[in-house]
Amino acid sequence: GSQHIRAEKAMVDGSWLDLAKRSKLEAQPFAHLTINATDIPSGSHKVSLSSWYHDRGWAKISNMTFSNGKLIVNQDGFYYLYANICFRHHETSGDLATEYLQLMVYVTKTSIKIPSSHTLMKGGSTKYWSGNSEFHFYSINVGGFFKLRSGEEISIEVSNPSLLDPDQDATYFGAFKVRDID
């Protein structure tokens, strides 16, 4: 009889443990933000991309905040950050101003408490996109593991924003917490 009670208690304890684990996992911050194609800046200069979706299509956010074009950290921790940026051009959409392009992405961390900004990751290449080619495409993917504090903000800068591919599977960035800071 006592064995049966112990087994039952273990089951109850186990399910509570599962529940606790699950609720902790559900509280783990994450975000996947996709480009808002209706508000992409024009031109070829380097700009900060401020318009992203957080709640439609593939875009989701939990226990993080998206505000003023920045992804805001709500919990201290170690996070995996990633960004994928696609550039494209088809001759039917117009001409290129120049055939020599620097296609770049910068993932930046801004701290409000101690006002400072740091580039966490950058990627890209110089490209020759001939005006005689009908179609051009180039993709950049960067990712890395960073210690982030509550209140810090992550933003994306790109060169040649007018060449951004506006599809949700092409231009996006995100973060997810991997572990607490000891």
């Epitope: 031109g43 039917t92 959409s93 001409d95 101003a97 120049t98 005689n132 009908e134």
Partner: antibody, heavy 118, light 111 residues
Framework: QVQLQQSGAELASPGASVKLSCKAS????????LQWVKQRPGQGLEWIGA????????KYTQKFKDKATLTADKSASTAYMQLNSLTSEDSAVYYC???????????WGQGTLVTVSA | NIVLTQSPASLSVSLGQRATISCRAS??????????MHWYQQRPGQAPKLLIY???NLESGVPARFSGSGSRTDFTLTISSVEAEDEATYYC?????????FGGGTKLEIK
């Protein structure tokens, strides 16, 4: 639809300058090169150069580098060509033009006649 | 600069007959699998009108009697059955390389 409206005829004295305009409508002015073409009376077509109105990039045929200056006003969707140190050789019809969505110059202004006469 | 040489300089064709105009480039105008040669029609007192783009593509609204062919340095504009309204000067043009250039023109007269 794409339209290119050019300024009226010009009569100028030798040595003077003229500034021709080309107002674009029906498309995003800053995303296509705007070209300029010269045609002397009874003669063929000559490509002068082109301007990309966004950043204002220009390209010229060598022959016209010192003769023509291309500029653009993005806010007015208007391109300009200034011709300086005019001689009788500059008497011609000048066209502004834009390529089609694929290639080839599909859109032309109506032309501006410049007459250089003492 | 790429020089385009058109021949003949003038051409007289009877109504309903075929007209053929040639354009030879001083170097190839092909790149990325396409030929950057275009054909225009210009009637007196009017701006040129695009007929054929990329060597063989008929511009929208242009009658099917017009056709273009060729690649690299040799190109041809053909009017299969000439009509009275086709009396005009025809120009070839390349935009493979800056500066863009035009041929000297071929004047088509209807007999």
């Amino acid at each position: 639809q794409v339209q290119l409206q050019q300024s009226g005829a010009e009569l100028a004295s030798p040595g003077a300058s003229v500034k021709l305009s080309c107002k674009a409508s029906g498309y995003t002015f800053t995303t296509y090169w705007l070209q300029w073409v010269k045609q002397r009376p009874g003669q063929g077509l000559e490509w002068i150069g082109a301007i990309y109105p966004g950043p204002g990039n220009t390209k010229y045929t060598q022959k016209f580098k010192d003769k023509a200056t291309l500029t653009a006003d993005k806010s007015a969707s208007t391109a300009y060509m200034q011709l300086n140190s005019l001689t009788s050789e500059d008497s011609a019809v000048y066209y502004c033009a834009r390529r089609g969505s694929r290639r080839g110059i599909a859109y032309w202004g109506q032309g501006t006649l410049v007459t250089v006469s003492a | 600069n790429i020089v385009l040489t058109q021949s003949p300089a003038s051409l007289s064709v009877s109504l309903g007959q075929r007209a053929t105009i040639s354009c030879r480039a001083s170097e190839s105008v092909d790149s990325y699998g396409r030929s950057f040669m275009h054909w225009y029609q210009q009637r007196p007192g009017q701006a040129p009108k695009l007929l054929i783009y990329l060597a063989s593509n008929l511009e929208s609204g242009v009658p099917a009697r017009f056709s273009g062919s060729g690649s690299r340095t040799d190109f041809t504009l053909t009017i299969s059955s000439v009509e009275a309204e086709d009396e005009a000067t025809y120009y070839c043009q390349q935009d493979n390389e800056d500066p863009y250039t035009f041929g000297g023109g071929t004047k088509l007269e209807i007999k």
